[in-house]
Interface confidence: low
């Protein structure tokens, strides 16, 4: 049968060789996972399965995305008689697509006497290994480097049965088994020099075409057994209709209507209901930069700005734990929100000999450079002697207040002799409670900081026995002249609440880089942002007005209609299927002729790089 | 599921301003166009004025009628589009419709429900 597109698909495993339960069991497992089955979207792997299993309901599997395993089973026969490809995406062992050994019980007769894999015309990766199959025939009698397409691929087929019936004559010594009907059907080996995969004849017009897996009927893309890469509606194609294509009036990839997803190897409109999109796949599950998030009803994985979300438990009332200590460090890895508190007492910085808890590696409190909010409040009793900052918590956003510390306090700092700034440089609101900071004889800034604008309500301070504010200037501890009036955390540009001029990645600095410099820059409010990469260093003049490749004053390689570009669009997909451009003299980029397939050096059809279309074979484009 | 939610439309003079506004009812993560259509009975649905945005600068596109009395602006923020309407013609009647789209790798696209615009005397 022909490429089709709905299919039957289920999920393979991933046990390996490890069983839970008797035969029976097993069995009833396998019964489940692949009656009905066409495509195993991952392995098949069938082990200790006992010699009465009737396992004709696995007839119907066309596809193992995976790899196959066999092995330590009993049954006479592995009835797969419409598996047509093996993809290996995963392999057995480090590299074996399939994988049949020690399928006999030796107590018995009972074994593996017939892999019925008549139609099996392909592993797309990986190699074989049948080996140690007492009773298993007709292994060697098949030419395995037709079906596997991978030249290098290991193939080890030895110790099998050793008294075998030979093929039927029909077969010309390529067998499954004895019967006229169990002939090996040959793809690859037999196809004339001309053909670059698979074929249906032996004649040089007989050659399949490049996306077909396994075989075909016909030359066409819609005569395949299977597919290479990707069946859309019928037809194997090297990728599903991606997410974006290039729209030639603007110049900018833009939403396809018409996109699909990759789901195993067939393309579909939409992903089934327990997968997500991740770019044009169906997944699983998000991976660990991404987070999943709902679209116009669409569930799809969307990077994350830096770390993922994560949500921690916290310290203090209501939580495990009385403070922050070595036997709960290690919990606070990767958070970004706490729920809850966080307390910094004696006993979890010095150990608690009675709780049998270990002093703490001052070191390991960088863990929580990835907080950016605290939902309940922040007490710090106690802080390593070496540390004079809080810097740690140097990405602390939001102090929640949901929780409050004794007299309702949200933020508490006391009796930290070392301390000299607070370093809370992105704090920027706390949200409920009372601010208390007391005897840390060494703390300079703090009374800098405007808390009325970090606060939602009038703000409530109780701020006293610091370093007296006079000491502090005479000290020249007094925030730096790049700060605004809004006050500052601690010394140098990075920690003031705002600047007097403009800021660079939280950094504040006298102008931005706009007519010199290495790296060019825009300003968006008081904030530099660097030129987009494609835009050309102007010397004494302005590179760009914005962060786009279409806001530079001169482009540094080409430019596509209003965008800078690399390199002009080479084989880029478009409406009507792939784009390619060269650049002129003043480095534009400009249309190829219609016919060119592979790219070209000017416009004309003689200007195309490699083969050119016939000019009745592709519809004139318009740019 | 997000929503978009239009306002600001209504019956106004030749010559009269109007500011329509437009937000999303939820947050949309990487919003990096968006843009107002006009659609007139018989007519198909018209790009009016449309801003995209790389990162947080904006670039905007007029149709030629809109050229010089109507300002686009999006705040990416709050998830939100304005279009100033200056010197209004009886042409510049029609429903108004707002999109916002995710121009990138998996990308989505949310259009509003549309606001009546009505210039007459």
């Known amino acids: 049968s022909e490429v089709g597109n709905s299919q039957a698909v289920c999920p393979g495993t991933l046990n390996g060789l490890s069983v839970t339960g008797d035969a029976e069991n097993q069995y009833q497992t396998l019964y489940k996972l692949y009656e009905r089955c066409e495509v195993v979207m991952g392995n098949l792997e069938i082990v200790l399965t006992g010699h009465n299993a009737d396992l004709s309901f696995l007839q119907w599997i066309r596809e193992v995305t995976g790899y196959v395993l066999v092995a330590m089973n009993e049954f006479s026969t592995l009835p797969l008689p419409n598996l047509r490809v093996v993809r290996g995406t995963q392999v057995y062992d480090g590299k074996f697509a399939i994988f049949v050994m020690l399928n006999y019980n030796t107590n018995s007769s009972h074994a593996l006497r017939q892999l019925r894999l008549t139609q099996l015309t392909e592993i797309l990766s990986g190699g074989v290994y049948i080996e140690k199959n007492d009773k298993l025939c007709h292994m060697d009698t098949i030419d395995w480097r037709d079906i596997v397409r991978d030249r290098d691929a290991e193939i080890v087929v030895k110790d099998n049965g050793r008294s075998c019936p030979p093929c039927h004559e029909v077969c010309k010594g390529r067998c499954w088994g004895p019967g006229s009907e169990d002939c090996q059907t040959l793809t690859k080996t037999i196809c004339a020099p001309q053909c670059n995969g698979r074929c249906f004849g032996r004649a040089p017009n007989e050659c399949c075409h490049e996306e077909c897996a396994g075989g075909c009927t016909g030359p066409l893309q819609t005569h395949c057994f299977a597919c290479r890469h990707f069946n859309d509606s019928g037809a194997c194609v090297p990728l599903c209709p991606q997410p974006l294509i290039y729209n030639k009036l603007t110049f900018q990839l833009e939403p396809n209507p018409d996109t699909k997803y990759q789901y195993g190897s067939v393309c579909v409109r939409s992903c089934p209901h327990n997968f997500v999109v991740d770019q044009s796949s169906c997944v699983r599950a998000c991976p660990s930069n991404k987070m999943e998030v709902e679209k116009n009803g669409l569930k799809m994985c969307e990077p994350c700005a830096g770390l993922c979300p994560k949500a921690c438990e916290g310290t203090g009332a209501g939580s495990h734990y009385q403070t922050v200590d070595s036997s709960n460090i290690d919990s606070f890895v990767n958070c970004t929100k706490i729920l809850g508190n966080l307390d910094f007492l004696i006993t979890g910085l010095e150990g608690d000999p009675w709780r049998n808890i270990s002093a703490l590696d001052p070191e390991k409190l960088n863990v929580f450079r990835t907080v950016r909010e605290i939902t309940g409040y922040l007490n710090i009793q106690s802080w390593p002697k070496h540390m004079h900052n809080f810097s740690v918590f140097s990405n602390l956003e939001t102090i929640g207040g949901r929780s409050l510390y004794n007299r309702g306090f949200s933020l508490l700092i006391m009796k930290n002799d070392n301390v000299t700034s607070l370093g809370l440089r992105s704090l920027r609101e706390v949200s409920a409670g009372r601010v208390y900071i007391t005897e840390n004889r060494r703390l300079c800034y703090l009374h800098t900081v405007q808390w009325a604008a970090l606060s939602r309500r009038r703000a409530d301070l109780d701020i006293r026995n610091n370093k007296p504010r006079g000491k502090c200037q005479q000290e020249g501890k007094v925030c730096d002249p790049l700060c605004s009036a809004d006050g500052c955390w601690g010394p140098g540009p990075a920690q003031c609440l705002s600047c007097r001029h403009y800021s660079r990645r939280g950094v504040c600095v006298e102008s931005c880089s706009f007519t010199q410099g290495e790296t060019r820059e825009f300003a968006e409010g008081t904030e530099c942002f660097e030129c987009h990469p494609e835009c050309e260093r102007v010397e004494g003049g302005i590179t760009c007005n914005g962060s786009g490749a279409d806001t530079c004053t001169r482009c540094a390689h080409y430019r596509d209609g209003p965008h800078c570009v690399e390199r002009c669009p080479e084989g880029i997909l478009g409406e009507r299927g792939p784009i390619y451009k060269y650049p002129d003299s003043s480095r534009e980029c400009r249309p190829c002729h219609e016919n060119c397939t592979r790219g070209c050096t000017g416009p004309l059809l003689q200007d195309c790089l490699g083969d050119a279309l016939p000019s009745a074979r592709r519809a004139p484009t318009v740019i | 599921e997000v929503q978009l939610v239009e306002s600001g439309g209504g019956l106004v003079q030749p010559g009269g301003s109007l500011r329509l506004s437009c937000s999303a009812s939820?947050?949309?993560?990487?919003?990096?166009?968006m843009g107002w259509y006009r659609q007139t009975p018989g007519k198909e649905r018209e790009l009016v004025a449309g801003?995209?945005?790389?990162?947080?600068?904006?670039?905007?596109r007029y149709a030629d009628s809109a050229k010089g009395r109507f300002t686009i602006s999006g705040d990416y923020a709050k998830n939100t589009v304005y279009l100033q309407m200056n010197s209004l013609k009886p042409e510049d009647t029609g429903v108004y419709y707002c999109?916002?789209?995710?121009?990138?790798?998996?990308?989505?696209?949310?259009w509003g429900q549309g606001t009546q615009v009505t210039v007459s005397s």
């Open positions: 801003i995209t945005s790389i990162t947080r600068v904006g670039s905007t």
């Open positions: 939820g947050s949309i993560f990487g919003l990096n166009a």
């Open positions: 999109r916002m789209s995710i121009v990138k790798s998996g990308g989505a696209d949310y």
